[in-house]
Structure formats: structure tokens, C-alpha cells
Interface confidence: low
């Protein structure tokens, strides 16, 4: 599969920054999502978790952008082996954790 360019990762990071900075009410009405293992396959795992949140316009662009980094089709209810067993967190916390990790990847030049 083609390697995602640094610009795509930068845009994803910028979108996550926008979400965290513009958050007024609880993000996605406080919806809970599965926590994921951030060490490998982070894009698909993040999408598999966030795709189960519906009706939340604030993260729709993030969901769409993550689709661009995940080479396989991801459907709601699909659970990755990278999911942290039986641990759910709020979408807001999930986004913050993902943002910190993606910033680290960007600094290290890991765009795939």
C-alpha cells in the first residue's frame, strides 16, 4: 500500500487539535469508545473504535480522514486485536490520547 504523506498526517493532527480546542460541551455527548493499543496499527484501530460513534458531527471529518490511512474496510462493530481489553473511555479522552501519539509519530517521521 502507498505510504501516507506527511501532509496527510499533519492535516489529521490539525483536525484533532481543532476538536480539542473548540470543545465546549462534552464531545459527542460523552459517548464512550474502546481504548486502543497505540503502539501499532494505530489508524485502523482508532477508526474501528471511533466508527461506532454515530450522529457526532464533530468527529465526522476525523473518521473520514482516518479512513484514508487504513487500507481495509472498517465497519461498525468490528473489533481490532489492538483494542485494550474491556476498557472504554470518553471520546474526548480518546482524541487527546490519539493526538499526543500522532504528534510523536510526526516528530519521529513515522508517516505509515
Amino acid at each position: 500500500s502507498p505510504v501516507p504523506p506527511s501532509t496527510a498526517l499533519k492535516e489529521l493532527i490539525e483536525e484533532l487539535v481543532n476538536i480539542t480546542q473548540n470543545q465546549k460541551a462534552p464531545l459527542c455527548n460523552g459517548s464512550m469508545v474502546w481504548s486502543i493499543n497505540l503502539t501499532a496499527g494505530v489508524y485502523c484501530a482508532a477508526l474501528e473504535s471511533l466508527i461506532n460513534v454515530s450522529g457526532c458531527s464533530a468527529i465526522e471529518k476525523t473518521q473520514r480522514m482516518l479512513n484514508g490511512f487504513c487500507p481495509h474496510k472498517v465497519s461498525a462493530g468490528q473489533f481490532s486485536s489492538l483494542r485494550v481489553r474491556d476498557t472504554k473511555i470518553e471520546v474526548a479522552q480518546f482524541v487527546k490520547d490519539l493526538l499526543v501519539h500522532l504528534k510523536k509519530l510526526f516528530r519521529e517521521g513515522q508517516f505509515n
Epitope: 502507498p2 501516507p4 504523506p5 496527510a8 484514508g68 474496510k73
Partner: antibody, heavy 123, light 106 residues
């Protein structure tokens, strides 16, 4: 406004060559994937070739492999299709297409199309 | 090579529902896309990722995809929906378009 403008079509004899160009405006082509899709007179759509948004990978339909070459000039914000050894069956309207937002071009829809340029291969 | 098969034509009365099918081996495991093309015009994306509508596409267009079949549904069909419709999927480093369906609004 995002727009694609194709040029370079025309009448060519069998065995001849043509180079199609697709100038993009309203966005930077280098950040996106691009495809060429053709449609023979009265027929359906046929995908021809794609250039990945991650800058390098190229893909071709079996019907044109070895004869057509897709390329991109980022400085000119333009996508190209070099067509060699043309055959009568290559006669079609050729559309330039922007492939969505993703670096993996196969995950996004072909959401911006040019108006098409006509290629006629005939003696 | 991978093939996507559509019915050549579908007829529908104004205000009724038109359903167009697209069949391919394990198509449900892939993303499906749908395009509308009116005579003399370039195709327009109406559904991506099986069931999502791009901005500007009316809500009457919806899609689904499971098993071997993707379906485009036009609810409350209008005269302006008369066009050719093509499904599309990605398989083994190539895009594949369906054979196309002409929708006629009676």
C-alpha cells in the same frame, strides 16, 4: 472552486501517440490521488490508470498496461496520460478525476471529475 | 479479473422507490461507490463507502452493501433522477466499474 480541465485529445491513427493533460485548480494535486477514466461511445465507464496520493505508486488497467503511462508534474499542478501504440478500441472520452482526500486513493470516492477530452483512433 | 454486474435497466414511476443492484464476489468485503451520469455530462459521485452521501447529494439517495450485493436506493424518485448509474469497487490494485444501469422515470 475545485476544477479539472483536460486537454490533448484529438484524432490519431492506429499505432500513434497522444498525451493528455489535466490541469487542476482550487487544490494541490500533489496532496491527492488522480485517475483517468474513459468511456467509449455508447458504452460504460472504464478505469484506465491512477497515480497515488502518496506520490509515486502508479496503477493501470490490464487493457492499457505497457502502452499508457500516468505521471504528474507538481510544479504545474497537472496530471498526464501518455498514450502510445493506440488502437481503435482506445477511442473514448477520457475523464480526469480527483480521488478524494485520502493518501490511500482506493478508499475515497472519485468526487471531482473533469469535463472530458475526446480521443479518436482511426485511419 | 473482478467483475461487477448490474441490471441493464430499471423503470420507476415518479414518487416511487427505485433499487439498483450491483453484484460481485464478496463485494460486501470491499467499499462500494455509486455514480450518476446524465447524457452529455460527467459522472457524479452519489454514494461513497457503501452508504455515505457527499455534500449536495439529496437524502433520497441511499446505499447498502453486504454479502455479494451492493444496492443503490432512490426513494421518492424524481424526473431529474433519470440517468445512468454505475457502481464501483477496488480490487487487487485496480478500480472496477459495474456494467451500468439506465434508470427511466415513467
Amino acid at each position: 472552486e475545485v476544477q479539472l480541465l483536460e486537454s490533448g485529445g484529438g484524432l490519431v491513427q492506429p499505432g500513434g501517440s497522444l498525451r493528455l493533460s489535466c490541469a487542476a485548480s482550487g487544490f494541490t494535486f500533489s496532496s491527492y490521488a488522480g485517475s483517468w477514466v474513459r468511456q467509449a461511445p455508447g458504452k460504460g465507464l472504464e478505469w484506465v490508470s491512477a497515480f497515488s496520493g502518496s506520490g509515486g505508486s502508479t496503477y493501470y488497467a490490464d487493457s492499457v498496461k505497457g502502452r499508457f503511462t500516468i505521471s504528474r508534474d507538481n510544479s504545474k499542478n497537472t496530471l498526464y496520460l501518455q498514450m502510445n501504440s493506440l488502437r481503435a478500441e482506445d477511442t473514448a472520452v477520457y475523464y480526469c478525476v480527483q480521488d478524494g482526500l485520502g493518501p490511500y486513493f482506493y478508499n475515497y470516492g472519485m468526487d471531482v471529475w473533469g469535463q472530458g477530452t475526446t480521443v479518436t483512433v482511426s485511419s | 479479473s473482478y467483475e461487477l454486474t448490474q441490471p441493464p435497466s430499471v423503470s420507476v414511476s415518479p414518487g416511487q422507490t427505485a433499487s439498483i443492484t450491483c453484484s460481485g464476489d464478496k463485494l460486501g468485503d470491499k467499499y462500494s461507490f455509486w455514480f450518476q451520469q446524465k447524457p452529455g455530462q460527467s459522472p457524479v459521485l452519489v454514494i461513497y463507502h457503501d452508504s455515505k452521501r457527499p455534500s449536495g447529494i439529496p437524502e433520497r439517495f441511499s446505499g447498502s452493501n453486504s454479502g455479494d450485493t451492493a444496492t443503490l436506493t432512490i426513494s421518492g424518485t424524481q424526473a431529474m433522477d433519470e440517468a445512468d448509474y454505475y457502481c464501483q469497487a477496488w480490487d487487487s490494485s485496480t478500480y472496477v466499474f459495474g456494467t451500468g444501469t439506465k434508470v427511466t422515470v415513467l
